[in-house]
């Protein structure tokens, strides 16, 4: 006999990086004929929502009209049919944006480089922060995390093709409280390099330290939920 | 103490040549970059040099008129410039590992003074 319902799915929109005092909706959604839902934000229960009527609802949304550095950390979600519990969602990391300062974003050797040059992002802020992130926007956008004073680098390795796109980065105060955005660069890369070398025995930036997450909502991928569930937002973990 | 000297600059027939160089000295870069800058306007990228390899890359502008090349054992960075133009009058300056900004320039810790390039049609 199953003692508990499969874990519901739980996202942020129309995004989990919320500027501060703008609002967002933490949606939940389980199984229809769930008749209570649970919000839980820090491992404490957060917001309770009951539908009705609830065979005829499978999702619920809780509503934070004004952004702040409180209401960031982690979320989860629960719901109940009859007497029995789900398991818990995945933990949704709802982050605040456009706190204090804002950084640059440099990058070496260049915006237009040649596939196999070596490329290296650099995101500096001179407040009190000693957390980078550096997001490539898209689809499936990527976070990568650095450290340093006032400054962290991001080598990309010898870059190809899947390279291009637009880059930001962000200070990260706390976890969970970010900066304003860089203002964007674009990186092109182009062709390949012809006759030279570029130091192949240099380490490339492993990969294992590249987290792949659902930034856009343009395409409505933040509706396909079991690629949300998937990537999980695991974004600081 | 970390120094960029550039030379080579002077005047020049419109369709001649001139090679500037930069001398590096003080530690080892990655790349050395050249700029230029003409009156009243904003400082622009023309070449990039790699160190190691010799990768190089070319402001659309200038490929093919122009080649960036290196001599590891003297640490010095030539600029060849051939076919030149009058739009090519400027200062031409050196910069080590330079990066390009957010703010859409390129900055760096170590500039050279510059050279005058000057063109006459």
């Known amino acids: 006999q199953q003692q508990t319902l499969p874990k519901p799915f739980i996202w942020a929109e129309p995004h989990f990086m919320v500027p501060k005092e703008k609002q967002v909706t933490i949606c939940c959604q389980g199984n229809y004929g769930a008749v209570e839902y649970q919000l839980h934000f820090e491992g404490s229960l957060f917001a309770v929502d009951r539908p009705k009527p609830p065979e005829r609802i499978n999702k619920v949304q809780f509503y934070i009209p004004d952004m702040n550095s409180r209401m960031a950390g982690q979320y989860s979600c629960i719901y109940r049919v009859g007497e029995l519990w789900s398991e818990p969602s995945n933990l949704l990391d709802l982050v605040v944006t456009e706190m204090y300062d804002t950084p640059t974003l440099s990058v070496h050797p260049g915006p237009e480089v040649i596939s196999g040059e070596k490329v290296t992002f650099y995101c500096r802020l001179d407040t009190a922060t000693s957390m980078f992130l550096l997001l490539k926007e898209g689809r499936s956008s990527h976070v990568q995390r650095g450290y340093g004073k006032v400054q962290a680098e991001f080598p990309l390795g010898p870059v190809t093709t899947a390279h291009r796109g637009t880059y930001r980065c962000f200070g990260s105060y706390n976890n969970h409280a970010w900066s304003f955005p860089s203002e964007p660069v674009k990186l092109l890369v182009t062709g390949d390099i012809e006759n030279t070398s570029l130091a192949p025995e240099d380490p490339t930036f492993p990969a294992d330290t590249w987290g792949t997450y659902l930034l856009t909502t343009e395409t409505g991928l933040q509706k396909d939920h079991a690629l949300w569930d998937h990537t999980a937002q695991n974004l600081l973990r | 103490q970390v120094q960029l000297v550039e030379s080579g600059g002077g005047m020049v027939q419109a369709g001649g040549s001139l090679r500037l160089s930069c001398a590096a000295s003080?530690?080892?870069?990655?790349?050395i970059h050249w700029f230029r800058q003409a009156p009243g306007k904003e400082r622009e990228f023309v070449a990039r040099?790699?160190?190691?390899?010799?990768?190089?890359f070319y402001a659309d502008s200038v490929k093919g008129r122009f080649t960036i090349s290196r001599d590891n054992t003297e640490n010095l960075v030539y600029l060849q410039m051939n076919s030149l133009k009058p739009e090519d009058t400027a200062v031409y300056y050196c910069?080590?590992?330079?990066?390009?900004?957010?703010?859409?320039?390129?900055?760096?810790?170590?500039w050279g003074p510059g050279t005058q390039v000057t063109v006459s049609s």
């Open positions: 040099i790699w160190w190691i390899g010799g990768a190089t």
């Open positions: 910069a080590a590992d330079a990066r390009y900004t957010s703010h859409g320039y390129y900055e760096s810790d170590y």
């Open positions: 003080g530690r080892t870069f990655n790349t």
